[in-house]
């Protein structure tokens, strides 16, 4: 009932709480003397359902039979309405729609860990709208059962509180659920377990890694687990890896011996402990562990190139290049690295140790057969040299690759092709693909950049610090014994007109014609390799068409000559540059008047 | 300090019921573990039944065969055993004990003597035939 319900009542058959689908009896009736003053007969109740009528009737009571009410809770009001008077409310009751509880399912209890306690979960089926209570009871050894009750309002786990010890690891116990409400009640099936059943132990914890003698091939890891595990199973990763590697161990007594872990490598690792071989379940995986390996000395072998320029009739400049090992190969960190320089025939040697660099320049005479040993060294040794006889490697023209190419393949990738030399193919060894910026001063500062590739190969995909819009000088080398042959081309990956074109810097007068000189378009301009110059002229104040003269594009040509130039006319002069995609905009512009005799 | 006594006891037939109070002093039950145990004459004392008054987990000897349950009112710091269906061989000086509730107990603990620190004087109950 909602209220005091001084006027009359509200009765409800057969229950205020029913199973959905039934049908309720309500009744309203007034107390004696309750009804509308001086006119009894007039009394009109009226039903509410919340705020909605759905009956009303003349006299002392009313009945309403009620069908299809939903689950949950509905409030049924009663009034009275009387001539030139609101409705006064009489009482009312609320009905409560819901179903028996269903059977609980899945019931499984689990203890965590030797010292944890026994906790229960189950899935309580459909909601059954009403105030429902759970009951858990846990039967076991010596006659025991214990019992516990749930009022939570959605109730599917339950702790007891009891810690179940190994005294008798195999003794059964049984777990069931009951549910219970004012429709009905329904017990889960019962759970039978042993106590290594439902110990799900701790994860381990402290967990420690030794290197005997710095050597990563005599590591042990160190755990501490609760006192009954049998099994542990361990897992670990490289840092930058998503795989796992797996081992399980039984009786490990929280120690074990890795095998194959790799030199200089930050690893992750995790154990995981179970009681019985069959019985129970893993525990959760331990807080990982992070540790770097220590170092080995390293494998494998640089790659080494390099580039002579001709200084003086006597000299010239050796540039040595080298590419880092692969982690896996350095197996630590390079301190440095070790460049020695020999004279084959004189015995002279020199060894230099270079650090923070993969580059080594120095100048040597232009007589004599020289090599190059380079190798790399970590705190634990140093990786077999690389040896290198220095050669002219373009000497040998008849090595020459032939038809070399080179055409953008996707974004930032060119692709270099071309045909073997004309002599003897199966003489070449291996092809080098050189490619670097081109810079018009040629300058040797600019990083180098090549890939090796099979004798068989005649094409090379180059991506390795390779820009947009920039123009490389790539070189095709063929190599043979101590002899090599080259070709050259110009490529870029993408291109577009360049920005600006060329600034002529002078306009000189020499017998009859002029010699036109410009800077070149700054590189980031160039958006590209260069094809061609255009220079065009024309008179001033002409509205003529202006002449032209196209120049292919070559690194270092930076003068011109024009020779059909009027005397004593004044022309207005400018420049062009032109990409594969397009043409600059002008240069700056100049007016030269030609002092000449007229012809 | 808590005191217990007990109370209800008496001569009744077999097939009778009865119900034995025990009411705490000196300190509420509201963090205790709360047993029942008998003790007929020339045998040791056994477990009834327990109660942890604060999560409403009770602990029961199925031997009984659930003819013994536990009941309590808050109000009166008093915990009942209404006893059912009794039977001659349910003779005994029945004695209630209290422990201040540990973290967790184990499966059997409730059940020793031992494991409780305050105990009633007893009060007798004969079942005759």
């Known amino acids: 009932k909602i209220d005091a319900c001084k006027r009359g009542d509200v009765t409800v058959k057969p229950s205020h709480v029913i199973l959905l689908g039934s049908t309720v009896n309500i009744t309203c009736s007034l107390k004696p003397r309750q009804g509308c003053f001086h006119y009894s007969r007039r009394n009109k109740l009226i039903l509410y359902k919340f705020d909605r009528r759905i009956n009303f009737h003349h006299g002392h009571s009313l009945n309403s039979q009620v069908t299809g009410l939903p689950l949950g809770t509905t409030l049924f009001v009663c009034k009275l309405a009387c001539i030139n008077s609101d409705e006064i409310q009489i009482c009312g009751a609320e009905i409560f729609v819901g179903v028996a509880p269903e059977q609980p399912q899945n019931l499984s209890c689990i203890q965590k860990g030797e010292q944890g306690t026994v906790a229960c979960t189950w899935e309580r089926g459909r909601d059954t709208h009403l105030y429902t209570e759970y009951t858990l009871q846990l039967s076991g050894p010596k006659n025991l059962t214990w019992q516990k009750q749930c009022k939570d309002i959605y109730c599917d786990y339950l702790d007891f509180g009891i810690n179940l010890t190994p005294e008798s690891p195999e003794s059964n116990f049984t777990a069931k659920v009951t549910a219970v409400n004012s429709l009905g009640s329904s017990s889960s099936l019962p759970s039978t377990f042993t106590f290594l059943d439902i110990v799900r132990p701790l994860p381990p914890w402290d967990i420690r890694i030794k290197f005997q003698k710095a050597s990563v091939s005599r590591c042990t890891l160190y755990w501490r687990d609760e006192g009954l595990v049998l099994l542990n199973r361990l897992r670990y990763r490289p840092s930058n890896s998503r795989l796992w590697n797996m081992v399980n161990v039984t009786k490990a007594k929280g120690r074990h011996d890795l095998l194959d872990l790799k030199p200089f490598t930050e690893y992750e690792f995790q154990i995981s402990s179970k009681l019985h071989l069959y019985k129970g379940s893993w525990s959760d995986w331990s807080e990982s562990l992070r540790a770097q390996t220590p170092e080995e000395e390293p494998t494998g072998m640089l790659d080494v190139w390099y580039m002579k320029r001709h200084i003086d009739y006597s000299r010239q400049q050796i540039s040595l290049f080298w590419k880092n090992l692969s982690v896996s190969e350095a197996r630590g960190k390079i301190l440095h690295y070790q460049v020695t320089l020999q004279e084959l025939t004189g015995g002279k040697a020199m060894t230099q140790n270079i650090t923070g660099h993969t580059s080594w320049t120095t100048v040597i005479p232009r007589t004599g057969n020289w090599a190059v040993a380079v190798s790399a060294a970590n705190s634990k040794g140093s990786s077999l040299p690389t040896r290198i006889n220095i050669m002219n490697l373009c000497e040998a023209g008849l090595l020459a690759p032939r038809q070399v190419s080179a055409n953008s393949e996707g974004m930032d990738n060119i692709l270099v092709t071309w045909q073997p030399p004309r002599k003897d193919p199966s003489a070449v060894q291996e092809y080098v693909v050189e490619w670097r910026e081109l810079h018009p001063g040629g300058d040797t500062q600019v990083p180098l950049n090549w890939l090796r590739s099979r004798p068989y190969n005649v094409s090379a995909l180059i991506s390795e610090n390779i820009k947009s819009y920039i123009c490389y000088e790539i070189r095709v080398y063929a190599l043979s014994g101590d002899q090599g042959g080259c070709s050259s081309i110009l490529g870029n990956s993408k291109h577009k007109a360049p920005l600006s074109g060329p600034h002529i810097n002078a306009i000189t007068e020499e017998k009859g014609s002029i010699l036109i000189s410009w800077n070149s378009i700054p590189v980031q301009e160039q958006m590209g390799c260069l094809l061609h110059y255009r220079i065009y002229w024309k008179e001033r104040d002409s509205n003529s068409q202006p002449q032209l003269c196209e120049i292919p594009y070559r690194v270092s040509q930076n003068s011109h000559p024009i020779n059909s130039l009027q005397p004593r006319v004044t022309y207005v002069l400018w420049m062009t540059a032109l990409t594969a995609a397009g043409e600059s905009s002008h240069g700056n512009e100049r007016e030269f008047c030609l002092q000449g005799k007229a012809n | 300090q808590v005191q217990l006594q007990e109370s209800g006891g008496g001569l009744v037939q077999a097939g009778d019921s009865l119900r034995l109070s025990c009411a705490a002093s000196?300190?509420?039950?509201?963090?205790?573990?709360v047993g029942w145990f008998r003790q007929a004459p020339g045998k040791e004392r056994e477990f009834v039944s327990a109660?942890?008054?604060?999560?409403?987990?009770?602990i029961r000897d199925d031997s009984l065969r659930g003819r013994f349950t536990l009941s309590r009112d808050n109000a009166k710091n008093t915990v009942y055993l209404l006893m059912n269906s009794l039977k001659p061989e349910d003779t005994a000086v029945y004695y209630c004990?209290?422990?201040?509730?540990?973290?967790?107990?184990?499966?059997?603990?409730?059940?020793?003597?031992?494991?409780?620190?305050?105990w009633g004087q007893g009060t007798q109950v004969t079942v005759s035939s």
């Open positions: 109660l942890s008054w604060s999560d409403d987990t009770t």
């Open positions: 000196g300190r509420t039950f509201d963090t205790y573990i």
């Open positions: 004990a209290a422990k201040a509730k540990p973290p967790a107990a184990t499966w059997s603990s409730y059940r020793n003597r031992e494991w409780y620190d305050y």
